[in-house]
Amino acid sequence: GITNINCSGHIWVEPATIFKMGMNISIYCQAAIKNCQPRKLHFYKNGIKERFQITRINKTTARLWYKNFLEPHASMYCTAECPKHFQETLICGKDISSGYPPDIPDEVTCVIYEYSGNMTCTWNAGKLTYIDTKYVVHVKSLETEEEQQYLTSSYINISTDSLQGGKKYLVWVQAANALGMEESKQLQIHLDDIVIPSAAVISRAETINATVPKTIIYWDSQTTIEKVSCEMRYKATTNQTWNVKEFDTNFTYVQQSEFYLEPNIKYVFQVRCQETGKRYWQPWSSLFFHKTPETVPQVTSKAFQHDTWNSGLTVASISTGHLTSDNRGDIG
């Protein structure tokens, strides 16, 4: 950008240095160079000389006009052609920015991931603003009326130790940039209602050769929450549609879930849980792949997700790696 250059004059922008994207703008350049009556004034945008829409206003001043300016950032400077000077003389420069005021933040969500020690608040910021936009998260105790504010550029982690005003809070988000300010609706929360259990993980799968072969999925969570509801979704990798099974779960031991699947098909599994009756779900777990055998049972490892075949009666899939899951609709 253009900063700390030695100016011999002035450059300014109308209506402003930061403006709404798509506006018409004028950039003015006024030379104040000793012993120079400029023959010509030139404008440069990002180092490239502008050829059109330049108007000479008087002996020392010129205007560059842009219609429908759509660039988020540009470095402008102007120069003068002075008599008896071989090179153009720099007058001054300025960085300009265009963008949008923030949208009203919506879908404000606060959750406490078990064992994290934090309340994590997120929101939908709306359309891209292109300019520096800050968010102030307000947390107000409904019991003590005390309000705390947290400044951030995206989401916020608030230590649960700092939430000393009881269990019930109002949370809202203010968005602000140089072009405007908006405020979300208030979200009312109870700390006990927003806890998301420790992540559920699928550890392995095996297909047992029975009269009708069945696949057993082994999965677990480190949660200390007693009443947990879970969903496991699965599908053939060639399919678009997920099948979903629901479970009421007690994680005092590793869970085993049985599925009767088509032979010689590669399946993918994911699991997620919530505290029973509460609002927020975990994100879906990492994708877990398992290929069912043709006739001989199969064991595959998640660490080796290329289709590995072992001899023997049972072949299982074992989870050791992490793969990216489809986390759309993570919380809710």
Epitope: W12, E14, A16, K94, A178, L179
Partner: nanobody, 121 residues
Framework: QVQLQESGGGSVQAGGSLRLSCAAS????????MTWYRQAPGKKREFVSA???????SYADSVKGRFTISQDNAKNTVYLQMNSLKPEDTAMYYC???????????????WGQGTQVTVSS
């Protein structure tokens, strides 16, 4: 509505100093770059110096090394320290705001009423 009030002008001998102030009031939502201009009798208004919101400064060649522009954000005031004054610095000095951002509340440019500086030889 922004009001700009210049002060600090007066009469001074050549080689002397003056400090002009431009106090801005009345704006809550808008941020501005601030510029000093001057106009001598029978002449056009000319640029003297400017300071951006980030503190970067610019000067006319005729005042470089003699004048210094500064700002006090807490007081919403811009200063022009004028040293080694010359008779050709005699003029009415005006300050002007240039808005940094166009927001939903309209931010316009504003001019002050001016303060007279007279330098005698």
């Amino acid at each position: 509505q922004v009001q700009l009030q210049e002060s600090g002008g007066g009469s001074v001998q050549a080689g002397g100093s003056l400090r002009l102030s431009c106090a801005a009031s009345g704006y809550t939502y808008c941020s501005y770059d601030m510029t000093w201009y001057r106009q001598a009798p029978g002449k056009k208004r000319e640029f003297v110096s400017a300071i951006d919101s980030d503190g970067s400064t610019s000067y006319a060649d005729s005042v470089k090394g003699r004048f210094t522009i500064s700002q006090d954000n807490a007081k919403n005031t811009v200063y022009l320290q004028m040293n080694s004054l010359k008779p050709e610095d005699t003029a009415m000095y005006y300050c002007k705001t240039d808005p940094i951002a166009t927001i939903s509340r309209r931010c316009d440019s504003y001019w002050g009423q001016g303060t007279q500086v007279t330098v005698s030889s």
